[in-house]
């Protein structure tokens, strides 16, 4: 079945970077874009960006523009999200989510990766 | 930037009907999608393009969208319907936008 499996939890110090992976299976990886959405503890969903899995084109939420890099590795059907210059407010669960090719909704979600930023 | 406003919480009696609203400027001209998130789990798409249910989502859930308000209605509420519900749209200037979420409690 369609699945998005993410890498494990991370504990990072302020100023560091984190790279989260998301391996897709059960569908043709390049048939859909991949989005990243984060959720701080007890808070709502915050969209971070969208990557085209064929062209590598990316659209970022302006809030993350300067420190977010989204990439894909088509050979392993894996998407990556790297966030740099981490601060305590970046403590959150980071989800990858498949964006339907012909619509702007997220029909399959990864289980999430908890990133804790603490000194 | 485009803003979606949801009620913080909605309470519904077992078996009764709950309606969750999502307000945004001229939201009726956009396609609205809804997600259900249970504690400790990833969100699940429960409604897309205003009123379409993904496979596996019961007919008890229905959606509508017009004017400045979109709604998700849960009929015959069950304990499993509890959790947070988020509306979402795509906007040409803000891209993907989520509402703040509504906590649904079944009593």
């Amino acid at each position: 079945q369609v699945q998005l499996v993410q890498s494990g939890s991370e504990l990072k110090k302020p100023g560091a970077s984190v790279k989260v992976s998301c391996k897709a299976s059960g569908y043709t990886f390049t048939q859909n874009n991949m989005d990243w959405v984060r959720q701080a503890p007890g808070q709502g969903l915050e969209w971070m960006g969208d990557i085209n899995t064929r062209s590598g084109g990316v659209i970022y939420n302006e809030e993350f523009q300067d420190r977010l890099i989204m990439t894909v590795d088509k050979s392993t059907d894996t998407a990556y999200m790297e966030l740099s210059s981490l601060r305590s407010e970046d403590t959150a669960t980071y989800h990858c989510a498949r964006r339907k090719s012909y619509g702007y909704y997220l029909d399959v979600w990864g289980e999430g990766t908890l990133v804790t930023v603490s000194s | 930037s485009y803003v979606l406003t949801q009620p913080v919480s909605v309470s519904v009696a077992l078996g009764q009907t709950a309606t969750i609203t999502c307000e945004g400027e001229q939201i009726g001209s956009k396609e609205v999608h809804w997600y259900h998130q249970r504690p400790g789990q990833a969100p699940i798409l429960v409604m897309f393009r205003d009123a379409r249910r993904p496979s596996g989502i019961p007919e008890r859930l229905s959606g509508s969208n017009s004017g400045n308000t979109a709604s998700l209605t849960i009929s015959g509420a069950e304990a499993g319907d509890e959790g947070d519900y988020y509306c979402q749209v795509w906007d040409s200037s803000s891209y993907t936008v989520f509402g703040g979420g509504t906590k649904v409690t079944v009593v």
Epitope: T28, T30, N52, S55, G57, V58, S101 | -
Partner: antibody
């Protein structure tokens, strides 16, 4: 939402030419844009496209001969050294969905005619 | 190199009839295939995308099918207004492409 090409004219072989596609009603930071040409009485010929981030892709035959670039409201196609075989109507086309990788084009301009002749 | 071969290049059919156009990709393009209609002096018009999804405002007489390398456009209940040239286009890869479009099929309606 629309696109319109301009800059087509009669040029002599070897004279560089830049065509401009002006967009309105949408943002080039959201949509990939393509250039397609059509020689008189011939079929559609894909030239290349530019992603939301400004990365360019070209058909094999077009590499080195054409350069695609963009500003906030325009997409340019530079023909570095036109030959008579470049005589064609040049179309600018927008992807149907955001960040969609040149998948399909639902908005086309009327085209601009380039004639290369000595 | 993801090249597209379209057949036939010309087809003639009567009003009310059916026309079938085929498009073959040199490598698998999944479902990233579109069909366009072009009339003289006009830009192409998107008819079908994702191999089988009808574009907005397009008649259901147009039907797309296929995946991988083999695709078909079927036009049923032909009307005079369907007289045009039809093109397929792959939208999967632009890394190694000679032409994303097929060679075109001219449809004449009698």
């Amino acid at each position: 939402q629309s696109v319109e090409e301009s800059g087509g004219r009669l040029v002599t072989p070897g004279t560089p030419l830049t065509l401009t596609c002006t967009v309105s009603g949408f943002s080039l930071s959201s949509y990939d844009m393509s250039w397609v040409r059509q020689a008189p009485g011939k079929g559609l010929e894909y030239i290349g496209y530019i992603t939301v981030n400004g990365v360019t892709y070209y058909a094999n035959w077009a590499k080195g001969r054409f350069t695609i670039s963009k500003t906030s409201t325009t997409v340019d196609l530079k023909i570095s050294s036109p030959t008579t075989e470049d005589t064609a109507t040049y179309f600018c086309a927008r992807d149907q969905y955001i960040n969609n990788g040149g998948a399909e084009f639902n908005i086309w301009g009327p085209g601009t005619l380039v004639t290369v002749s000595s | 190199a993801y090249d597209m071969t379209q057949t036939p290049s010309f087809v003639e059919a009567a009003v009310g009839g059916t026309v079938t156009i085929k498009c073959q990709a040199s490598e698998s393009i999944s479902s990233w295939l579109s069909w366009y209609q072009q009339k003289p002096g006009q830009p192409p018009k998107l008819l079908i995308y994702q191999a089988s999804t009808l574009a907005s405002g397009v008649s259901s007489r147009f039907k797309g099918s296929g995946s991988g390398t083999q695709f078909t456009l079927t036009i049923s209940d032909l009307e005079c207004a369907d007289a045009a040239t039809y093109y397929c286009q792959q939208g999967y890869s632009y890394g190694d492409v000679d032409n994303a479009f097929g060679g075109g099929t001219e449809v004449v309606v009698k």
